[in-house]
Interface confidence: low
């Protein structure tokens, strides 16, 4: 059905990372345009990118409003030029993306280690708390902030001279962990959501190594 | 077990001023926004203000009806949060709660059992 | 500051019966509001988010509606355990809490 000039878009897909999300579809249009509808399932359908000739539309302001809803959205078709003609059966195609749940599937972004402070044979390693884009009373929410304790931390350790790595995992954004005196260690960390089944862990963290800029060092 | 224990509450005269604590437990402080929040006898809830976590640069904000004479600041290293509260009126006379603030849903989930303050002639 | 009128200030029902309460905010606040429910010698304890979403663990005869200025919260069916005082929160622009509704049993 529909006019035919205009084809329904597919490949419906959800771009989320720390919330920020955007949702992406084909075919790039060829004398046609898109709108973007988005709704709670037990909501009104709000429309975004109004007759954009883009592919992608980014949501992140709507879902923001309440991260543990579930999202629906649709794309519609319309013909360049003529926005108001629609198809066949009285309305313009339009294409269901999946259901998405941000809590439960933005992806985690890649975590930095802020620093890392040794003190005899003992390390500090403090991961940074990345900033999301979900707003509150006029600031925007870190990771911990949104997800409390189901967000850990695990890091990953080894002395620069070989490669054997040891990991520590925390749900708070510290470590306390035990090394050799003398010796210098590498550090890498990776962000955890234990009880998703999907998109559970983040890329590692770039590794960071005692010895450089990074660390702050006093030996006791 | 997470525990809040407010200190500092008694009488003081209108134009006074009183410093309340609240001493924290079981949680990792520093992580957490933290907010005050009265109730005057026979009223209801009031929020006071809130300083945010260290992530956050400890920011305060407050309500309009004690900004400029209150001023709420934090320890971590001591776990504590504190109120200091200045050129007090007979309408601040009321219970004063410190709760953990959740900020992404506006959650008080745990709360102290309260001081009183009296601001009486 | 925001302001938030809650009624009524307080409201007698029969067990089983359905109650509702509303809160009205001086100026739109798209849908950030929470209910709270306070019990003598207890922390005020958050059964809704976000206008509608129930927190975890709350019993489904809890339900919250509307947007913009005008929030509704309703209780289905009335238990025992329901006594208490009821707050709404707007947290769209700082924090302000309604004046409260004192819930009793008939």
């Known amino acids: 059905s529909g006019t035919t000039n205009t084809v329904a878009a597919y490949n419906l897909t959800w771009k989320s990372t720390n919330f920020k999300t955007i949702l992406e579809w084909e075919p790039k249009p060829v004398n046609q345009v898109y709108t973007v509808q988005i709704s709670t399932k037990s909501g009104d359908w709000k429309s975004k990118c109004f007759y954009t000739t883009d592919t992608e539309c980014d949501l992140t302001d709507e879902i923001v409003k309440d991260v543990k809803q579930t999202y629906l959205a649709r794309v519609f078709s319309y013909p360049a030029g003529n926005v108001e003609s629609t198809g066949s059966a009285g309305e313009p195609l339009y294409e269901n993306s999946p259901e998405f749940t941000p809590y439960l599937e933005t992806n985690l972004g890649q975590p930095t280690i802020q620093s890392f402070e040794q003190v005899g044979t003992k390390v500090n390693v403090t991961v940074e708390d990345e900033r999301t884009l979900v707003r509150r009373n006029n600031t925007f929410l870190s990771l911990r902030d949104v997800f409390g304790k189901d967000l850990i931390y695990t890091l990953y350790y080894w002395k620069s001279s070989s490669s054997g790595k040891k990991t520590a995992k925390t749900n708070t954004n510290e470590f306390l962990i035990d090394v050799d005196k003398g010796e210098n260690y590498c550090f890498s960390v990776q962000a955890v959501i234990p009880s998703r089944t999907v998109n559970r862990k983040s890329t590692d963290s770039p590794v960071e190594c005692m010895g450089q800029e990074k660390g702050e060092f006093r030996e006791i | 077990e997470v525990q809040l224990v407010e200190s500092g509450g008694g009488l003081v005269q209108p134009g006074g001023s009183l410093r309340l604590s609240c001493a924290a437990s079981?949680?990792?402080?520093?992580?957490?926004?933290m907010s005050w929040v009265r109730q005057a006898p026979g009223k209801g809830l009031e929020w006071v203000g809130f300083?945010?976590?260290?992530?956050?640069?400890?920011?305060?904000e407050y309500a309009a009806s004690v900004k400029g004479r209150f001023t709420i600041s934090r320890d971590d290293s001591k776990n504590s949060l504190y109120l200091q509260m200045n050129s007090l009126k007979t309408e601040d006379t009321a219970v004063y709660y410190c709760?953990?603030?959740?900020?992404?849903?506006?959650?008080?989930?745990?709360w102290g059992q309260g001081t009183l303050v009296t601001v009486s002639s | 500051d925001i302001q938030m009128t809650q009624s009524p200030s307080s409201l007698s029902a029969s067990v089983g019966d359905r109650v509702t309460i509303t809160c009205q905010a001086s100026q739109d606040i798209n849908k950030y509001l929470n209910w709270y429910q306070h019990k003598p010698g207890k922390g005020p304890k958050l059964l809704i988010y976000y206008t509608s979403t129930l927190q975890t663990g709350v019993p489904s005869r809890f339900s919250g509606s509307g947007s913009g200025t005008d929030f509704t919260f309703t209780v289905s069916n009335l238990q025992p355990e329901d006594i208490a005082t009821y707050y709404c929160l707007q947290y769209d622009n700082l924090l302000t809490f309604g004046q409260g509704t004192k819930l009793e049993i008939k």
């Open positions: 079981g949680f990792t402080f520093t992580e957490y926004h």
């Open positions: 300083i945010r976590n260290r992530a956050q640069g400890y920011t305060t």
């Open positions: 709760a953990r603030l959740t900020m992404v849903v506006a959650e008080f989930d745990y």
